[in-house]
Structures are given as structure tokens and as C-alpha cells.
């Protein structure tokens, strides 16, 4: 019994005069804007996006919107076309949704914020944006009160008119409309495809948060990883950083390239490599391989408990007003607008701490 290293878990609620507001990362579920896909993009990435078959032709489809089909047929006319160099990172950056177009309004603690307060971050969803990233020398924002008026409130246009037509199932096209959101510590990168939650257009979604600080014990009392990050890419250890690190190694090993959201200096995967190797390999790693990426728990981590609720937007009463305000049709407003409210429930944090049962 002397050699049993037992621990106990202590729960505590700690009142705070202020709390650091978390980083909020959001991604449009559509990866590429239809209007930004050029002839050269279509030539190189058309098959990856299931817009072309392997003979560079538009597949025989009865599902196509006439206007979109007409535009694509024009772009897919490759007679006498000289392909130019193509880079997936540049494509994601240029054709991904722009926060300046999506963000209709932004307030933090009642003060106006703007697209400039969102930092571009690449994830498996492509070009995404983080509010309050704490990077580029910007201070981490604080909040002094709980409740909706003391957090982040944004109104977004998801731009469904820009969604790529879906003529096949690929990892780069989405059946859904909306955004994916992750609320996370500034000390860890977003891992939004695995850990994010969905927010739908036509709703105002309220996310009430509670900060939880978890303190684990290292071996032999517990199983946390006390060492600093052994990584070329991340400064501090987190399960997310470890998994991204590991997924990157796995792809480089299997495909000799990396996806655009992955760190490092391996070449970016080409559209062919995405289709033939990177997408299936990463899907396999995430879904099937239980051993390659075993990431230990860090000894200290901050997570955010969340409670979500939602109401309809627009109401019948406000539909005409919003349509006029944003110079869109009522139908457009109903299909594209969402409001997201993220706030602390109360100004305290919860500590969940493993302690040695006896010294």
C-alpha cells in the first residue's frame, strides 16, 4: 500500500474581479467562395471539389443551378488554356470567405469591434478567424462582469450565395450551411474540425461560458505531461498542439506534403495529393488509428464549459427592417444571418485540482 500513489480531486469556485476573455475561432462551413474560383483554380482543383471529372469536364448533373452551371461551363472551357502555377495555400487564402464581408456588426463589452480584431488562422475548414487571439502583440481582452452585455456579440452573413455547388462527396465540400465555432485558451491553437460547435443561420445563439482551470498530477500520482512542448511548431504544450503536431508528421510521412493548416516547412499538398493521399490519410488517422497520436494530458489547462441556447432571427416583425438595413431580400436575411453571443455566466472560475492523497 506504501507504493500506491493515490490522489484526491478538489473542486473549488473562485471569485474573480476580472477574467481573461477566451479566444473565439470561427469558420464558414463553405471553404471556397464560388465567385473567387478562377479558371486556373478550376483547372487544378476542380476534381478535388467534385466540380469536374478526371477529364476536366463538368460532370453530367441534373442538380446544377442554371446560373452557376453557365458560369462554370464558361470557366471549364479549357481550349487553348495555358495553366498557370497553383498553390493550395494561396487558393484557400484568396478564395476563402473574408471576415470583412461576413461581419455585419461586432461588439465586445458594448464597444464596437471590427474585422481588424479578427486574426486569420488556417484550419481544416480553410481560412478562419480568431477573435482575441492575443497574438501580434495584442493584449488579451478582459471582462469585468458576467452576462450578455459583457462579452462578444457578432452578427454574421454566411454568404450562402457563394457556396460551391455540391455534385459529389468530398472533404472540401459541405452539405451544411453555417459556421463552426471554438472557444479556447489563447495558449492553444484551434482544432475546430474536431472540437468546434455549429452555429446555424436564422438563429441568435447564446453561449454562456464558465472558465475551468484543471490541474493534474504527473506520474506516479496521475498521468499528466509535465514537460514543455517538444515541438518545432508550438511554444506551449496542449493536447491540441500535440495532435496538430502529430497529424502533420503523419501526413508528411504518408504523403510527403502538409495540408495548408499544418505548420512546418514541408511542401503544401497539391490538389491531387489532397484527393489521393492527404484527405483519406487524415480521415484514417482521426477515425481509425488509435495509436499514432497518443497525446498526454498537460498538467495545467484551461477549458470553457458552455451552455448553448438559441432564438429565431429575424422575427416576422424585424425581417423587413433588417432586409432594408443590409440591402438584401427578406429571404436572404433568413437564410444567411446569424447572431452569436458569447459571455461568462458569472465572474468566477472553477478549479478542478488533483492533489496527492498523502505526502
Amino acid at each position: 500500500y506504501y507504493f500506491c500513489y493515490h490522489h484526491v480531486t478538489k473542486l473549488d469556485e473562485v471569485a474573480a474581479s476580472q477574467l481573461t476573455f477566451p479566444a473565439v475561432t470561427l469558420c464558414n462551413l463553405n471553404e471556397f467562395r464560388f465567385s473567387q474560383v478562377s479558371k486556373n483554380d478550376l483547372y487544378h482543383a476542380g476534381e478535388l471539389l467534385a466540380l469536374l471529372n478526371n477529364r476536366y469536364e463538368i460532370p453530367d448533373t441534373q442538380m446544377a443551378d442554371e446560373k452557376q452551371l453557365e458560369i462554370l461551363q464558361d470557366k471549364a472551357n479549357f481550349r487553348s488554356f495555358k495553366p498557370k502555377p497553383f498553390n493550395m495555400r494561396e487558393f484557400y487564402d484568396r478564395a476563402g470567405h473574408d471576415i470583412r464581408d461576413m461581419l455585419l456588426s461586432c461588439h465586445f463589452r458594448g464597444e464596437a469591434c471590427s474585422a481588424e480584431d479578427f486574426k486569420v488562422v488556417f484550419t481544416r475548414y480553410g481560412k478562419c478567424y480568431t477573435f482575441n487571439s492575443g497574438q501580434d502583440g495584442r493584449p488579451r481582452l478582459k471582462t469585468m462582469k458576467g452576462g450578455t452585455g459583457n462579452g462578444l456579440e457578432i452578427m454574421l452573413d454566411i454568404q450562402q450565395d457563394e457556396y460551391l455547388p455540391v455534385w459529389g462527396e468530398t472533404d472540401e465540400t459541405s452539405f451544411e450551411a453555417g459556421i463552426k465555432v471554438q472557444i479556447h485558451s489563447q495558449d492553444e491553437p484551434p482544432f475546430i474540425d474536431q472540437l468546434g460547435f455549429g452555429v446555424a443561420p436564422g438563429f441568435q445563439t447564446f453561449v454562456s461560458c464558465q472558465e475551468q482551470r484543471l490541474i493534474y498530477l504527473p506520474s506516479p500520482w496521475g498521468t499528466c505531461n509535465a514537460v514543455t512542448m517538444d515541438s518545432d511548431f508550438f511554444d506551449s504544450y496542449s493536447i491540441t498542439a500535440c495532435r496538430i503536431d502529430c497529424e502533420t508528421r503523419y501526413l508528411v510521412e504518408n504523403c510527403n506534403c502538409r495540408m495548408v493548416h499544418m505548420p512546418g516547412d514541408a511542401p503544401y499538398c497539391t490538389p491531387e495529393q489532397y484527393k489521393e493521399c492527404a484527405d483519406p490519410a487524415l480521415d484514417f488517422l482521426v477515425e481509425k488509428d488509435q495509436e499514432y497520436c497518443v497525446c498526454e494530458m498537460p498538467c495545467n489547462l484551461t477549458r470553457y464549459g458552455k451552455e448553448l441556447s438559441m432564438v429565431k432571427i429575424p422575427s416576422k416583425a424585424s425581417a423587413k427592417y433588417l432586409a432594408k438595413k443590409f440591402n438584401k431580400s427578406e429571404q436572404y436575411i433568413g437564410e444567411n444571418i446569424l447572431v452569436l453571443d458569447i459571455f461568462f455566466e458569472v465572474l468566477n472560475y472553477e478549479t478542478i485540482e488533483q492533489k496527492k492523497a498523502y505526502e
Epitope: E253, N254, C277, P280, A281, D283, F284, K288, Q290, E291
Partner: antibody, heavy 116, light 107 residues
Framework: EVQLLASGGGLVQPGGSLRLSCAAS????????MSWVRQAPGKGLEWVSG????????YYADSVKGRFTISRDNSKNTLYLQMNSLRAEDTAAYYC?????????WGQGIRVTVSS | DIQMTQSPSTLSASVGDRVTITCRAS??????LAWYQQKPGKAPKLLIY???NLESGVPSRFSGSGSGTEFTLTISSLQPDDFATYYC?????????FGQGTKLEIK
């Protein structure tokens, strides 16, 4: 080039034992699960056994459970299949394969004949 | 264990024909299905992985589709070299299982 080279087949009497080996090259062997697949003369393909990259987890088809043991030596980049209590119905060509998002490559196939 | 049912067992066709082989899983295997071609005395050759991905070097007349429990392998225009036995395999979960095979022969 990613390659698998199997060896160790032959003729053995019913109730006897045999150990198959599969030497891997061209990839980080310890990162990948591996499997053995067999094919009896004139019959279809049958998965026999699988092992995780570290060797911690092993899996078997019901037809060989308790008689066959899969193992690996990551320092030697080699996969093994220890076959005990062999039966006539174990007569087959045995293939090793690298598991991943696609099972590629496969070894060349080793003939095992169980006959008195 | 997941059962894989392949049909037909034998298929007679002519050069130039379009042929389809189907594979049905007894429970959902997502898209973790592969198709192999095998000729007598040879190791199986991978054609399609993850239900619809064409293996490098395999002619584009081969294509795969499906997800969940229903899958198909299509050869758009049969060539003399395509007469062989074809197997589907699920690699969604242990025990991994193969279909019983489809022998494609000259009509």
C-alpha cells in the same frame, strides 16, 4: 520504395508449427499497423490477424484464435506470424500487408502446405 | 463480425462492355472499403481505396462509389487485361473481412 518481403513458408505436418516473417523497408515500420491475409487454393481472400504499430494490440480471425500469434520487432522492421497446431485447412498463400488509409503494399505471398 | 456480400459471383462480359460489381456490408463501414483485382498466382492488386479513390497507376476506367453499406465497382469499358477476380474488403473494424469474390470472364 515501400516494400514487404515475406519468408518462412513450407510443408508441415498437421499439428506442427511454422513461423512466417515479413521484412519491411521504405517506411517508418513502427508507425503502422500490419496484417496477415491468406488465400487457400482456389478460394477467396481471408484476413487472418492484425497488430498495432507498437505491438500492444493484436487481433485474430475466429478460425485461428488460440493457435496463431502475431508479433513484431520494430527494431528489426519485421512482422511475424507464429502458427501452431496447424490443420489441413490452414494450407494457403499467406500475404503480409501494411494497414493505413489504403492497404499498400502487400508482400509477395508465401505458400504454406499442411499435409501428412 | 461484419459480413461482406459481393455480387455477382461470376460475370460474363465482352471487351468494351460497362460492368458493375456490387458489395454490401452487413452494417455501416462509412467509406472504409477497398477493391482489389487478382490474377491467378499473383498477389491482390489495389484498385480503389476509401470507397472511391483510384489508386495511382490504375486506369481511369475503374471507379468506385458508395458509403455506409452499399458499394459499387464500375469498369466503364472492359479491356482484355481486366478479366480477373475482384474482391471488396472492409477495413472499418476488426475483424477485417473480404467479399467472396467476383470472377469476371470473357463472354
Amino acid at each position: 520504395e515501400v516494400q514487404l518481403l515475406a519468408s518462412g513458408g513450407g510443408l508441415v505436418q498437421p499439428g506442427g508449427s511454422l513461423r512466417l516473417s515479413c521484412a519491411a523497408s521504405g517506411f517508418t515500420f513502427s508507425s503502422f499497423a500490419m496484417s496477415w491475409v491468406r488465400q487457400a487454393p482456389g478460394k477467396g481472400l481471408e484476413w487472418v490477424s492484425g497488430i498495432s504499430g507498437s505491438g500492444v494490440s493484436t487481433y485474430y480471425a475466429d478460425s485461428v484464435k488460440g493457435r496463431f500469434t502475431i508479433s513484431r520487432d520494430n527494431s528489426k522492421n519485421t512482422l511475424y506470424l507464429q502458427m501452431n497446431s496447424l490443420r489441413a485447412e490452414d494450407t494457403a498463400a499467406y500475404y503480409c500487408a501494411k494497414e493505413a488509409y489504403k492497404w499498400q503494399p502487400w508482400g509477395q505471398g508465401i505458400r504454406v502446405t499442411v499435409s501428412s | 463480425d461484419i459480413q461482406m456480400t459481393q455480387s455477382p459471383s461470376t460475370l460474363s462480359a465482352s471487351v468494351g462492355d460497362r460492368v458493375t460489381i456490387t458489395c454490401r456490408a452487413s452494417q455501416s463501414i462509412s467509406s472504409w472499403l477497398a477493391w482489389y483485382q487478382q490474377k491467378p498466382g499473383k498477389a491482390p492488386k489495389l484498385l480503389i481505396y476509401k470507397a472511391s479513390n483510384l489508386e495511382s497507376g490504375v486506369p481511369s476506367r475503374f471507379s468506385g462509389s458508395g458509403s455506409g453499406t452499399e458499394f459499387t465497382l464500375t469498369i466503364s469499358s472492359l479491356q482484355p487485361d481486366d478479366f480477373a477476380t475482384y474482391y471488396c474488403q472492409q477495413y472499418n473494424s476488426y475483424s477485417y473481412t473480404f467479399g467472396q469474390g467476383t470472377k469476371l470472364e470473357i463472354k
